[in-house]
Amino acid sequence: HTVELNNMFGQIQSPGYPDSYPSDSEVTWNITVPDGFRIKLYFMHFNLESSYLCEYDYVKVETEDQVLATFCGRETTDTEQTPGQEVVLSPGSFMSITFRSDFSNEERFTGFDAHYMAVDVDECKEREDEELSCDHYCHNYIGGYYCSCRFGYILHTDNRTCRVECSDNLFTQRTGVITSPDFPNPYPKSSECLYTIELEEGFMVNLQFEDIFDIEDHPEVPCPYDYIKIKVGPKVLGPFCGEKAPEPISTQSHSVLILFHSDNSGENRGWRLSYRAAGNECPELQPPVHGKIEPSQAKYFFKDQVLVSCDTGYKVLKDNVEMDTFQIECLKDGTWSNKIPTCKIVDCRAPGELEHGLITFSTRNNLTTYKSEIKYSCQEPYYKMLNNNTGIYTCSAQGVWMNKVLGRSLPTCLPECGQPSRSLPSLVKRIIGGRNAEPGLFPWQALIVVEDTSRVPNDKWFGSGALLSASWILTAAHVLRSQRRDTTVIPVSKEHVTVYLGLHDVRDKSGAVNSSAARVVLHPDFNIQNYNHDIALVQLQEPVPLGPHVMPVCLPRLEPEGPAPHMLGLVAGWGISNPNVTVDEIISSGTRTLSDVLQYVKLPVVPHAECKTSYESRSGNYSVTENMFCAGYYEGGKDTCLGDSGGAFVIFDDLSQRWVVQGLVSWGGPEECGSKQVYGVYTKVSNYVDWVWEQMGLPQSVVEPQVER
């Protein structure tokens, strides 16, 4: 009879064990364990009748199709085998054990005692068959195994082979290289790769297989396993496989599909191809005169582009439009997109006008083409070129007039400063009891008239100022402060300010230049109570033309000490010139005591300590700050006075040979102008040089050379 056993382990004994087994007996034990296991069988006791080749009694161990062992006897001989310590292993999950005894037993034999157990199969070690083993990695576990893949691969649905996702490859460049996955390593199994070459219409794709070509094939059947197919429109080329690469393929199309198929077996290295776009050829090109074509090639094909450029000093001219370069392209029909343009010499055209300057052509016929030369010069002696520039400009290859230092910027003609058209005399009387100034002696002198119509009644007063440039007047802040009923500092409205330049006699303003104000700028820290920071600027509505009677004064260098004691300076003004007129009288009589003709005086700078002491001895708050200096004589008699306010106190600078504004008429008192030991107090301009340049919007370097030449 047959016994079915399905447990993972068990015991099998001969009938009647441990007693002797009966004669003429046959029992079969069929052991089945789950897949992934095999059966291990061993005997703890074995005692059967001996016979030649186990013909009488035996134990036979077999699988479905194979006898694994036949045992009999008590000990192993040449012709019979006992299990002893031997273990029988089934190859699969089934084992059949048959015990048989014949009709007669000469002795009593006790039979056998056997044990079996299910043991795990290590499929990863044991599977030799490529059809069953894992493609990349094998992982064993009790009762089974599973496969996995290297990075970039996907496990196929057969759970064994590793494929790649390669169905979405698009190539749009005009040349390229396409390979099988992992080339030159063996390509993955079970994969369907699709490569699309999609070029612009007008190109044709040429394919060429290179290097190794190794695709699994078959000796009789054409490419049954792995293959390449090339699809061009409706036409399919291939399949291709084996070790011989296809010949170069001219597809005559701009769109090509390459299909690569691999099955679940084989170890082949794959393939590599290069592709390149071909197009129609365009005619040969001739570069223009004075020009060149880049790139220079023997042949040009569809989509090739060339850049036409001209030699230095020439411009590309196309349809009357000048340009630096011009690009043309080889079209798909084999023609060029445009005709070759011409090269025309660069023309800088008429140079820009220079304010207060002249232009001279150095090249014959007043040529303005490439490499022509011009020279700018300033209207001397009233203007001088900034930084002593040569003024020479050359027509550049870019079509602009260029100077070695300034580039394309025009030079600047700066007003010459501190150089009167007539020399100032050494002997000078005073403004008080004064001396008339000759026209042109003080060309920087400005008369500032303020008519404040916002006041009730309207207010009118005047002061002096000094021309710093064609557009800016320097004066005292108190001249341009609204005459308010409190001590708040508010500038007068620019609409209420008129500036006269080149004025000599106030009765005759016909020869003078009068200008209105564009801006009135008081020093932000001007203090009405002590006149500290008594400095201001007026920007003129329009720059004034310079000439013998209108020229700027120079600003000093930045030096906190100011002018040295005892240095002599000149001051001019139209203020009170009659020593018998008192301050109170001028206040009450308005402008009637204005001097008709410009007066001037020569005054020495007073040591600061002496001036401070002279004012501290008076009643009232008369502080002389570090932003002020004094000038005048101890004995009096020569002084500036009311109406001279804001006028320039100028000192001749030996280094630059120019007149420099060191002070501005600010205040004095409380005694009458020209009184004994009443020094005139002046704003120390050298403390404000940076502020002045900042307001005028010019860097200091612009003017320093003017003073230090």
């Epitope: 916002s454 009730v456 108190h478 308010r484 009923r485 409190d486 001590t487 708040t488 508010i490 409205s493 009405i528 109570q529 002590n530 006149y531 301050v583 206040i587 009232g620 708050n621 008369y622 205040w667 008192g669 409380p670």
Partner: antibody, heavy 114, light 112 residues
């Protein structure tokens, strides 16, 4: 002719803020300053502060500098005085004046009461 | 801060008589540079804003009758109404504008 027209009377609770406006016409608003002065019932005049519309410069009486804010809107030629953290003693008529006190607004009564 | 003190607090004057109001400042209001005293006088009638009469201590505002005059310098100033008229009944204030602004406490002028 020059006119300064102030906003209407206000009643406020202690701790609140009030903003009084002063609209100028008849002269160039940015060329002169605006002063603010107040007068408590039956009391004298007290200067609050000053603003110059051209550059927004301000000056304040120390007594008010933490609570008063003076501003201008040059597009509408209007000056504003805002007083915060009101208390009952801020009850007063508030005046604006311009062109150095030549012209005055009609006054705005601000009553602070709980 | 500059303190302004007016005297008397009130004043009763017959019509056509002279009225004098004094104002004293705690520091000088004379600016030595401009030679001006920064003091103004105002008149205020009930229910009206103040009206400027005098500035720079002695300069009359345009449109102000010449019976009003100002004098003084430094710290002591006077407003004089040379011949009191009925319409002059008001409170008069002095104000310094030398350093910010400060008003005096006011002087009430009535007809006797």
């Amino acid at each position: 002719q020059v006119q300064l027209v102030q906003s209407g009377a206000e009643v406020k609770k202690p701790g609140a803020s009030v903003k009084v406006s002063c609209k100028a016409s008849g002269y160039t608003f940015t060329t002169d300053d605006i002063n603010w002065v107040r007068q408590a019932p039956g009391q004298g005049l007290e200067w609050i502060g000053w603003i110059y519309p051209r550059d927004d410069r301000t000056k304040y009486n120390d007594k008010f500098k933490d609570r008063a804010t003076l501003t201008v809107d040059t597009s509408s030629n209007t000056a504003y005085m805002e007083l915060s953290s009101l208390r009952s003693e801020d009850t007063a008529v508030y005046y604006c004046s311009s062109l150095e006190d030549t012209y005055w607004g009609q006054g705005t009564l601000v009553t602070v009461s709980s | 801060d500059i303190v302004m003190t007016q005297s008397p607090d009130s004043l009763a004057v017959s019509l056509g008589e002279r009225a004098t109001i004094n104002c004293k400042s705690s520091q000088s209001l004379l600016a030595s540079r401009t030679r001006k005293n920064y003091l103004a006088w105002y008149q205020q009638k009930p229910g009206q804003p103040p009206k400027l009469l005098i500035y720079w201590a002695s300069t009359r505002e345009s449109g102000v009758p010449d019976r009003f005059s100002g004098s003084g310098s430094g710290t002591d100033f006077t407003l004089t109404i040379s011949s009191l008229q009925a319409e002059d009944v008001a409170v008069y204030y002095c104000k310094q504008s030398y350093n910010l602004y400060t008003f005096g406490q006011g002087t009430k002028v009535e007809i006797k």
